[in-house]
């Protein structure tokens, strides 16, 4: 059994065959004698009953209203009525792009990670018996594939696979040739699996400072988009009016991860700022990483090995 048309709002391209199938079809077969009616309303017209005499392009079957093909003036609201059952659809018919093999507004966009498996199959169950050939195009160039009936691509994504893939079904009806197009815009991106965030540089940093001067402690990390980076210091963050957290800066890496840096600015350094831990932490669902800064008076530098200093 074909799936019924359950979406209440539908956009289609002019010139293509199209059908609406109501969702109480099994019920309709049980009640063969029940009167079943299709109606259309649009702007000026209220509920006009549809029948094959309404238009040579319209065909009515038990459960289906067919358009051969659908045209711009078919835009409007459609109703199916049977006893106390009513189903309504709003149909929007859009103009075909005559300069391309597909219409941009009818494209389904998908993001596929590189090396991930994807499969495109051109298959049309409703018009199956009428389809005499089906082709798959990439960026409007026909792909030469083995299976002409249901052309299929199965592969692990590579960057060169990016593009517009159009399945075009060619079918005959009443001596006329029609085609139906379905297009996917596939964008290939870097592997988006999460990394374990890491803070850059040594875990413990002694910073030589002078009293009364200012210092900027820079904390940098490689992290995922949803990860956070923050500073912890003193008994209670924010208790020292001379300490300010600057706005976090983020740059996206070519691999789709983020390079973040957050500066802690300490103004008018006093004795209370010396020899205490200023901790920078990066946190993610996968865990945390912390690095520490200790401010040391320049005069005391001789007591500490040179390799632990940062500027």
């Amino acid at each position: 059994a074909e799936s019924c048309t359950s979406r209440p709002h539908i956009t289609v391209v002019e010139g293509e065959p199209f059908y609406l199938k109501h969702c109480s079809c099994s019920l309709a077969h049980e009640i063969e004698t029940t009167t079943k009616s299709w109606y259309k309303s649009s702007g000026s017209q209220e509920h006009v009953e549809l029948n094959p005499r309404s238009s040579s392009r319209i065909a009515l079957h038990d459960c289906v209203l067919e358009f051969w093909p659908v045209e711009l003036n078919d835009t409007g609201s459609y109703f199916f009525q049977m006893k106390n059952y009513t189903q309504k659809w709003k149909l929007n018919v859009i103009r075909r792009n005559k300069h391309s093999c597909f219409t941009e507004r009818q494209v389904t966009s998908k993001i596929v990670e590189v090396k991930k498996f994807f499969q495109i199959t051109c298959e049309n169950s409703y018009y199956q018996t009428l389809v005499n050939s089906t082709s798959l195009y990439k960026n409007c160039k026909k792909l030469l594939l083995e299976n002409n009936k249901n052309p299929t691509i199965k592969k692990n994504a590579e960057f060169e696979d990016q593009g517009y893939y159009s399945c075009v079904h060619f079918l005959h009806h009443n001596g006329k040739l029609f085609n139906i197009t379905k297009t996917f815009n596939i964008t290939i991106v870097e592997d988006r699996s999460n990394i374990v965030p890491v803070l850059l540089g040594p875990k413990l940093n002694h910073v030589a400072v002078e009293l009364g001067k200012n210092v900027r402690l820079n904390c940098s990390a490689l992290l995922n988009e949803e990860d956070v980076i923050y500073w912890m210091f003193g008994e209670e963050n924010g208790s020292d009016p001379n300490i300010h957290e600057e706005k976090e800066m983020r740059i996206m890496t070519p691999e789709g991860k983020w390079h973040a840096s957050k500066v802690l600015r300490i103004e008018n350094i006093g004795e209370s700022n010396l020899n205490v831990l200023y901790n920078c932490t990066v946190a993610s669902t996968g865990g945390t990483d912390t690095k520490s800064f200790i401010l040391v008076r320049k005069a005391d530098m001789a007591d500490i090995p040179g390799h632990v200093f940062t500027r």
């Epitope: 059994a1 799936s3 099994s26 389904t108 998908k110 596929v112 991930k116 498996f117 994807f118 499969q119 495109i120 199959t121 051109c122 298959e123 049309n124 169950s125 409703y126 199965k154 893939y165 399945c167 079904h169 139906i180 197009t181 379905k182 996917f184 596939i186």
Partner: nanobody, 129 residues
Framework: QVQLVESGGGLVQAGGSLRLSCAAS????????MGWFRQAPGKEREFVAA????????YYADSVKGRFTISRDNAKNTVYLQMDSLKPEDTAVYYC??????????????????????WGQGTQVTVSS
Amino acid sequence: QVQLVESGGGLVQAGGSLRLSCAASGRTFSKHAMGWFRQAPGKEREFVAAIDWSGGSTYYADSVKGRFTISRDNAKNTVYLQMDSLKPEDTAVYYCAADSYTDYAQLWLPELESEYDYWGQGTQVTVSS
């Protein structure tokens, strides 16, 4: 609308086997690609295996390749996951999922959770060592 109900979970010893079933209601079952996902305690839900609408293509996570087999019976509206050589790390709640159906062409991204529109409630699988 597709409703999914999983069954067949339980407690099994390492090295043992289980067969999970996922029964679907709805007359369009044969139009949906189906997948199995699992979620271990404290971990994110992860892809296990998937099968396309025709049953012509199957796809597996590396961690289960060669041990698990997915199949479907469109006449019975059921998808199966045969799990052999089970390991303690296979312990999880196993979820069955169905993707959305599109007319005229199907793009199948089996590993992508967001591609699946319909989900079952899950069945617990516990593998003891």
